[in-house]
Structures are given as structure tokens and as C-alpha cells.
């Protein structure tokens, strides 16, 4: 069977007025999954992202994360969409250096 | 001008099926997630679940996960909510909803789905 | 899931009137929180997105103000097109989730 996402979002300073947002999928099984940035409800184009490869994390699952840098203060306007297994979530940036998890069940 | 049209009420009998449409028009139905919301008479809103019309993956409030059905057809436009096993409690307004980013920017006009006997 | 309570669920007011509505969430909801106004027999209108954004075409004696768990709709010089019913919602996990309402009317 599949195991669906651990999805956790993340904030840093990037440079003056940026911040970097990332996301993080983890503990998912099969490894096909889509994770990616959407402002405004849209997909963010691919050169916008970095994107990190699909690993094992060492328990039969996989991890895999996307990031984006934005201007600060515009944090509320991007949602990280996660994709796996027919099943999708959104995820939106948190207030603060705070980080947050989310599970998404199938 | 963002629209969403849905079907007509509907009237149906505990135990059956009841499918509601929405058609988009005025913007990229494949670029956003279309939620669904309930509204009990005199009550209070309720998210159903969603779906990415793109690819056809969906959301489901783990409420209705057993009996609900949310799926897209992009050739015309038109997001689905199939509610099986219906029960008087079911009685309500049905809304499709634009999931802009982070909130609702648009909503159809609603369809009322009565279970009766 | 996170629990959305309204408060008051009914108020009566004059026109004219400075109205404010709260709404409190069971856990940080982060500003992810929006207001909608619904009249019998309609579908929810948006009036503020992100806590304190007003929406396009919505008149400024709406505002919205808050963070964390505590946020407010007030509006600043009620209007007789302003008797409605007023929910919040969070967006800031799925189940997405709504407030009770407060239903606004005529003193």
C-alpha cells in the first residue's frame, strides 16, 4: 500500500527584504510524488524552484523538498501543494521562524 | 468575469446518490483547486474536500471520505461532487468553490440536494 | 481539527453603528483566516482574505485585524446592505473550518 507525506514548511532569511521557503515531504511510499510552489493558487515555474532529489530515508520511504525565495511580507500568498498517490494537500507558509507538520492521510 | 455555474436542486430518497456539477468559465480551470462546502438549513458552512482539476487528485474532509466522490472534467470545464448513501442529515446547499492561494475568491451560486422519504 | 468559535452568534444593531465581530481559533491559524458575508438565499460573499486584506470592490468601513488565535471583522459604520450573516474561516489546515456565524439585524 502507500504511505502518504509528512509535509513540513519552513522559513529563512535569504538576503535584505527575501526569505527562502522550503518544503519537505518525508516518510512517503511509492516515490512518485509532486511537490511544488504555488502563488495566488497557481504553480510557481520551474525556474523559480530548486527542487531536491527523491532519496530513501532509510525506513522503505522517501523524502524528497522544494524551495523558493520570495519578498518578505508575501509569505501569505504562497501555498507549497503536495501530490502523491491521487491524494493532494496544500500547505501554506507559517508566521515567524516557526515550522510546522503536517500529515496528510489518505 | 470568474464563474461558477452549478446544477439544479435535487431531490432524493435515503440511501440513493446524488451527483452536483459545476462549470467554471472566465479563467484556467486546470491552474486551481475547486473546493466544496455544505450549508445545512440555518447552520453553519462545512468544507467537503477538493480536487486539482489538472490532475484529478483530491482532499477529503475525513468526514465524508467513505460516501464522497470529487472528480473534474477538463474538456468541459466541469468539477463533480458524488455524495452516495444519502441520509436526511445530507439535506443542504452544496457550493463549489476558486481556491485562490489561501481562500475562497468565488463561489457558485449553490444547489440544493432534499433527502426525503 | 481546528475549531472556529464566533462570537456573538446574533447581534442587533442601528445604522450608523461601529459592529465587531470575533472569531477564535482552537490553534495558531497563523492569519490564515478569512471573513465572508452571506444574505438568505445566496452563496458566501468574500470581505477579507489573510486576516485584514480586503477583498476587490469591498467598502472600507470593513476591516479585518488579528493573529495567532484572535481575530476581529468590524465594521466601522454599519449600512442598511450590511445586514447579513458573517462567518470566518481558517485556511490554515485542512479540514478547512468555519466559524457558527453572527447574524447582523436591524434594531
Known amino acids: 500500500g502507500s504511505v502518504p507525506p509528512m509535509v513540513n514548511v519552513t522559513r529563512s532569511e535569504a538576503s535584505e527584504g527575501n526569505i527562502t521557503v522550503t518544503c519537505r515531504a518525508s516518510s512517503f511510499y511509492p516515490r512518485n510524488i509532486t511537490l511544488t510552489w504555488r502563488q495566488d493558487g497557481v504553480s510557481l515555474s520551474h525556474d523559480t524552484q530548486q527542487w531536491g532529489d527523491v532519496l530513501p530515508d532509510g525506513n522503505g520511504t522517501y523524502q524528497t523538498w522544494v524551495a523558493t525565495r520570495i519578498c518578505q511580507g508575501e509569505e501569505q500568498r504562497f501555498t507549497c501543494y503536495m501530490e502523491h498517490s491521487g491524494n493532494h494537500s496544500t500547505h501554506p507558509v507559517p508566521s515567524g521562524n516557526s515550522h510546522h507538520h503536517h500529515h496528510h492521510h489518505h | 468575469e470568474v464563474q461558477l455555474v452549478q446544477s439544479g436542486a435535487e431531490v432524493k430518497k435515503p440511501g440513493a446518490s446524488v451527483k452536483v456539477s459545476c462549470k467554471a468559465s472566465g479563467y484556467a480551470f486546470t491552474n486551481y483547486l475547486i473546493e466544496w462546502v455544505r450549508q445545512a438549513p440555518g447552520q453553519g458552512l462545512e468544507w467537503i474536500g477538493a480536487?486539482?482539476?489538472?490532475?484529478?487528485?483530491?482532499n477529503y474532509n475525513e468526514k465524508f471520505k467513505d460516501r464522497v466522490t470529487i472528480t473534474a472534467d477538463t474538456s468541459t470545464s466541469t468539477a463533480y461532487l458524488e455524495l452516495s448513501s444519502l441520509r436526511s442529515e445530507d439535506t443542504a446547499v452544496y457550493y463549489c468553490?476558486?481556491?485562490?492561494?489561501?481562500?475562497?475568491?468565488?463561489w457558485g451560486q449553490g444547489t440544493l440536494v432534499t433527502v426525503s422519504s | 481539527d481546528i475549531q472556529m468559535t464566533q462570537s456573538p452568534s446574533s447581534l442587533s444593531a442601528s445604522v450608523g453603528d461601529r459592529v465587531t465581530i470575533t472569531c477564535r481559533a482552537s490553534g495558531n491559524i497563523h492569519s490564515y483566516l478569512a471573513w465572508y458575508q452571506q444574505k438568505p438565499g445566496k452563496s458566501p460573499k468574500l470581505l477579507v482574505y489573510?486576516?485584514?486584506t480586503l477583498a476587490d470592490g469591498v467598502p472600507s468601513r470593513f476591516s479585518g485585524s488579528g493573529s495567532g488565535t484572535d481575530y476581529t471583522l468590524t465594521i466601522s459604520s454599519l449600512q442598511p446592505e450590511d445586514f447579513a450573516t458573517y462567518f470566518c474561516q481558517q485556511f490554515w489546515t485542512t479540514p478547512y473550518t468555519f466559524g457558527q456565524g453572527t447574524k447582523v439585524e436591524i434594531k
Open positions: 489573510y486576516a485584514e
Open positions: 480536487i486539482n482539476p489538472g490532475s484529478g487528485a483530491t
Open positions: 468553490a476558486r481556491f485562490l492561494g489561501n481562500y475562497f475568491d468565488n
